[in-house]
Amino acid sequence: QRKRRNTIHEFKKSAKTTLIKIDPALKIKTKKVNTADQCANRCTRNKGLPFTCKAFVFDKARKQCLWFPFNSMSSGVKKEFGHEFDLYENKDYIRNCIIGKGRSYKGTVSITKSGIKCQPWSSMIPHEHSFLPSSYRGKDLQENYCRNPRGEEGGPWCFTSNPEVRYEVCDIPQCSEVECMTCNGESYRGLMDHTESGKICQRWDHQTPHRHKFLPERYPDKGFDDNYCRNPDGQPRPWCYTLDPHTRWEYCAIKTCADNTMNDTDVPLETTECIQGQGEGYRGTVNTIWNGIPCQRWDSQYPHEHDMTPENFKCKDLRENYCRNPDGSESPWCFTTDPNIRVGYCSQIPNCDMSHGQDCYRGNGKNYMGNLSQTRSGLTCSMWDKNMEDLHRHIFWEPDASKLNENYCRNPDDDAHGPWCYTGNPLIPWDYCPISRCEGDTTPTIVNLDHPVISCAKTKQLRVVNGIPTRTNIGWMVSLRYRNKHICGGSLIKESWVLTARQCFPSRDLKDYEAWLGIHDVHGRGDEKCKQVLNVSQLVYGPEGSDLVLMKLARPAVLDDFVSTIDLPNYGCTIPEKTSCSVYGWGYTGLINYDGLLRVAHLYIMGNEKCSQHHRGKVTLNESEICAGAEKIGSGPCEGDYGGPLVCEQHKMRMVLGVIVPGRGCAIPNRPGIFVRVAYYAKWIHKIILTYKVPQS
């Protein structure tokens, strides 16, 4: 009997994720099963499904499959976090490149090489043809997308909408052309999933046909996603285990990027006089091992043969015979010139003393290995081994214990805002350390901010100038009071937490503040029935430069018809330009007879570049900022609404996408407002809510 192929390798996995259909017309099919592999086989074969299966979710708790005719890129669908779910999306539907002749290509390109729009497959105008979707089941002849149903030489093609041109190939690149790597590909995180001889790679989270030690949960920083080629062990280039039982592993054909420079977040800090961490960034000229025996040249095979050559290990600076650490050993080393001693460590190179020169980190600091052990507020860090239980509570993989030594500042959870540590203080369980990013390090902590890749759906005293009064459902709006006067706005994001701005706190005495919820009138007139007045028990300051504050309430707010929470966006998401948004506030409105009612001003999202132009180039926006312009001249936030939200709606869901902060002008005609981008700080907010204790109601 022919063994059924295991098709799960054809899917991209997103752990702890499910898809929610917003459009009720979309169908789904469910069934109890034992494994995700069973779901995958049925999805691939479309057996018993009334639609073409593009993705499925495996519910680990209920042992259930949910098959979908859509994926996360489809409209009418949103991604949602859920511990018990794993989302698997058929790669063919999300790939934007072809493998071989592109027979399996199921992407959405619908324009030919010369730029002509494709004719729909189900249409006979302008060209009659026999390529009907019903005749080519499984070939996905949908809409007018480029396809290669017969696997012909030129790759995917289509009939064109131009009566003069019957058909033409489409310009879809080979995946091997799209994918590229720097150096020897240790930082490669691309989507190549087959070897240079065309064998399909085995999933890293599977042990068949080949058993191996590279388990994704054991090596969370190695990028062991799905069955993509990786270089976890210092090989000359990325490789993978194959699905061929007779070929354990093979290299992958990934070309070197044109600009072959290190651009990942893991670039070791280069030093010349001393060793930082394991010395992977050591670029000095020491050329003897610890006992004085000279090193062998890296480009020589005498007296020791080896493959640690400069060609195989680009970017590792294997010059001359200098001590280096190209393979992640415990410290710099070299082959020796003594035929009887193959290798030796250069342990005479001193460790960099952290007190000399400025301590700094690159990227998000996940590879920071310095000796700082104090938080930005001066608290001494507590030992990592005493806090592992807490760490496991908010990360879903096994942290690299070898990095978590003593009580040094580290970044085991891939925090976007740098190294941190636990404190031993129950009020401040953890905080960031006072370390800056290294000068000149421009690695973005979120990529592709200008491309709407991730959907956002799952926002002082600034005043809304010329806004209109509002009494719609704005139960998340908070009036922060300082000495009994309204000082700032804020957003209730959880029963015990208000998101607001740092500038709203002139006094460090928390008794000076109150939070008013459920009000419409800034003085609370007529709101007696619905008003909740809560004291403030703690302020948690956002990452450096964010100007955000999470204000903890002394007791949780009671959610009712007048008080509600507002959702946060997904981390790193982008909201499309021209999305309609609103700012809310009780501040100065430009009216002499100000009635004290909560106002709303309608704005629309503007891209960062365009926004900078509107500010006459004087302002450069970065990934932590979001811009919105007024539809009506002179309408927008102003002094008095600081801390308040920029609220946007996506997929019928309202979210706080920005926080109003000072310093960017106020309701100036043709000058859009710049807000703190909440999506950039969403992980920090979730981490605080998860780790800080709150009083029970």
């Epitope: 740092r502 002139p506 100007d547 000072p662």
Partner: nanobody, 122 residues
Framework: EVQLVESGGGLVQPGGSLRLSCAAS????????IGWFRQAPGNEREGVSC????????YYADSVKGRFTISRDNAKDTVYLQMNSLKPEDTAVYYC???????????????WGQGTQVTVSS
């Protein structure tokens, strides 16, 4: 009586230095974030610098970055603004006030002082 009093202004040549003081009376200064503001004739008041009571962090307007330094002496209930490399465009009345302070700027709240005149001219 609760108040803030500025001092240290004067006439100075371009490139010169001045040190302004903001002293509190009637309340403990270290509980409050203090900001320096200035207003030149015919111009709006602008925030110059602030020092936070929350964590000691500081903010400087772009126009004074690298030239001005803010500091506080809690024992003396005083905040200082050290102004170096002064330029004619720094001419203004300088005020201190209880403020909100952050990386994006500062907001004045209460307890304004009466101001001290700084004139930079050759």
């Amino acid at each position: 009586e609760v108040q803030l009093v500025e001092s240290g202004g004067g006439l100075v040549q371009p490139g010169g230095s001045l040190r302004l003081s903001c002293a509190a009376s009637g309340f403990t200064l270290d509980h409050y974030t203090i900001g320096w503001f200035r207003q030149a004739p015919g111009n709006e008041r602008e925030g110059v610098s602030c020092i936070s009571s929350l964590d000691g962090s500081t903010y400087y307007a772009d126009s004074v970055k690298g030239r001005f330094t803010i500091s506080r002496d809690n024992a003396k209930d005083t905040v200082y603004l050290q102004m170096n490399s002064l330029k004619p465009e720094d001419t203004a009345v300088y005020y201190c006030a209880v403020a909100g302070c952050g990386a994006y700027g500062l907001i004045p709240y209460d307890y304004w002082g009466q101001g001290t005149q700084v004139t930079v001219s050759s």
